[in-house]
């Protein structure tokens, strides 16, 4: 039984491969799914010698490993691509790597938008 899940309607969107895939590079994504399916947000990125390279962000459809997560946290040690998911609108705006081996917690915040 699922209880009290945060409803996800919109996520931060980003696609590093936007030109090749002919999509927008960044913005907001409105999540659409089937009835009785939960919706989540996700972020994926690479870490090359401490430099964070964002791969994709957006909506992620019904994945039990994402249930009941308020924050986007990855804990895998050294994957080729880091992945995290969460529930709640725009919960993928910031994302965290919290390594199992007791290394430093690293949270990635979006840069502040420049005033117009």
């Amino acid at each position: 039984s699922g209880r009290g899940e945060a409803e996800t309607r919109e996520c931060i969107y980003y696609n590093a491969n936007w030109e090749l895939e002919r999509t927008n590079q960044s913005g907001l994504e409105r999540c659409e799914g089937e009835q009785d399916k939960r919706l989540h947000c996700y972020a994926s990125w690479r870490n090359s010698s401490g430099t964070i390279e964002l791969v994709k962000k957006g909506c992620w459809l019904d994945d039990f490993n994402c249930y009941d997560r308020q924050e986007c946290v990855a804990t895998e040690e050294n994957p080729q691509v880091y992945f995290c998911c969460c529930e709640g609108n725009f919960c993928n705006e910031r994302f965290t790597h919290l390594p199992e081996a007791g290394g430093p917690e690293v949270t990635y915040e979006p840069p502040p938008t420049a005033p117009t």
């Epitope: 039984s1 699922g2 209880r3 009290g4 899940e5 009785d36 399916k37 996700y42 994926s44 019904d62 994945d63 039990f64 490993n65 249930y67 009941d68 997560r69 946290v73 990855a74 804990t75 895998e76 992945f83 995290c84 998911c85 919290l98 199992e100």
Partner: antibody, heavy 119, light 107 residues
Framework: EVQLLESGGGLVQPGGSLRLSCAAS????????MAWVRQAPGKGLEWVSA????????YYADSVKGRFTISRDNSKNTLYLQMNSLRAEDTAVYYC????????????WGQGTLVTVSS | DIQMTQSPSSLSASVGDRVTITCRAS??????LNWYQQKPGKAPKLLIY???TLQTGVPSRFSGSGSGTDFTLTISSLQPEDFATYYC?????????FGGGTKVEIK
């Protein structure tokens, strides 16, 4: 290295109870949903139950609903399966399995513990 | 519940053979289909997830394809360590269900 170690299996009479445990190590247990999958002797795999990262969402196969309860203690890195009103058809090897990150699959499994229900 | 039907239930093959196992879902499951390998007395091991993505560390001779209701696991050149039972599993909706298994035996 990811390790899942089940314990608590054994011989029990029909109508009896058992509690299985799965001790997890080598990964951040609290960041992964977990499941129990069973395999009757000489048969295929059957998903039994699953629990979300916080324990806030739990799901059961119809065959065990109302008799089995899944739970987790993230402070002890341990997954549990409380099995009540056991029947002969519950006889199986019970595996603890981890839900992979971004895979929608069981990416790590324990070696299993045998539960035998017989009089 | 979604029923998963695997075929064949068993097959005999030789080292170096190309082996194909099929899995059919009773309704569309998009690409939410996983493949596992199990050897006698051992726990299952994830080979392929989301129909075609190879799990880290799995040899490239294993491949998966399909979407909707029909899926295929292919072993391009069977090796001695590949003799085992293979299961498909849908992760589209609970209850998550497995196919009946395909036992790959030595000819």
């Amino acid at each position: 290295e990811v390790q899942l170690l089940e314990s608590g299996g054994g011989l029990v009479q029909p109508g009896g109870s058992l509690r299985l445990s799965c001790a997890a190590s080598g990964f951040t247990f609290s960041n992964y949903a977990m499941a129990w999958v069973r395999q009757a002797p000489g048969k295929g795999l059957e998903w039994v139950s699953a629990i979300s990262v916080t324990g806030g969402s739990t799901y059961y196969a119809d065959s065990v609903k109302g008799r089995f309860t899944i739970s987790r203690d993230n402070s002890k890195n341990t997954l549990y399966l409380q099995m009540n009103s056991l029947r002969a058809e519950d006889t199986a090897v019970y595996y603890c399995a981890r839900h992979g990150s971004g895979t929608r699959a069981f990416d790590s499994w324990g070696q299993g513990t045998l539960v035998t229900v017989s009089s | 519940d979604i029923q998963m039907t695997q075929s064949p239930s068993s097959l005999s093959a030789s080292v170096g053979d190309r082996v194909t196992i099929t899995c059919r879902a009773s309704q569309s499951i998009s690409r939410h289909l996983n493949w596992y390998q199990q050897k006698p007395g051992k726990a299952p091991k994830l080979l392929i997830y989301e129909a075609s993505t190879l799990q880290t560390g799995v040899p490239s001779r294993f491949s998966g394809s399909g979407s909707g209701t029909d899926f295929t696991l292919t072993i391009s050149s069977l090796q001695p360590e590949d003799f085992a039972t293979y299961y498909c599993q849908q992760s589209y909706s609970t209850p998550w269900t497995f196919g009946g298994g395909t036992k790959v035996e030595i000819k």
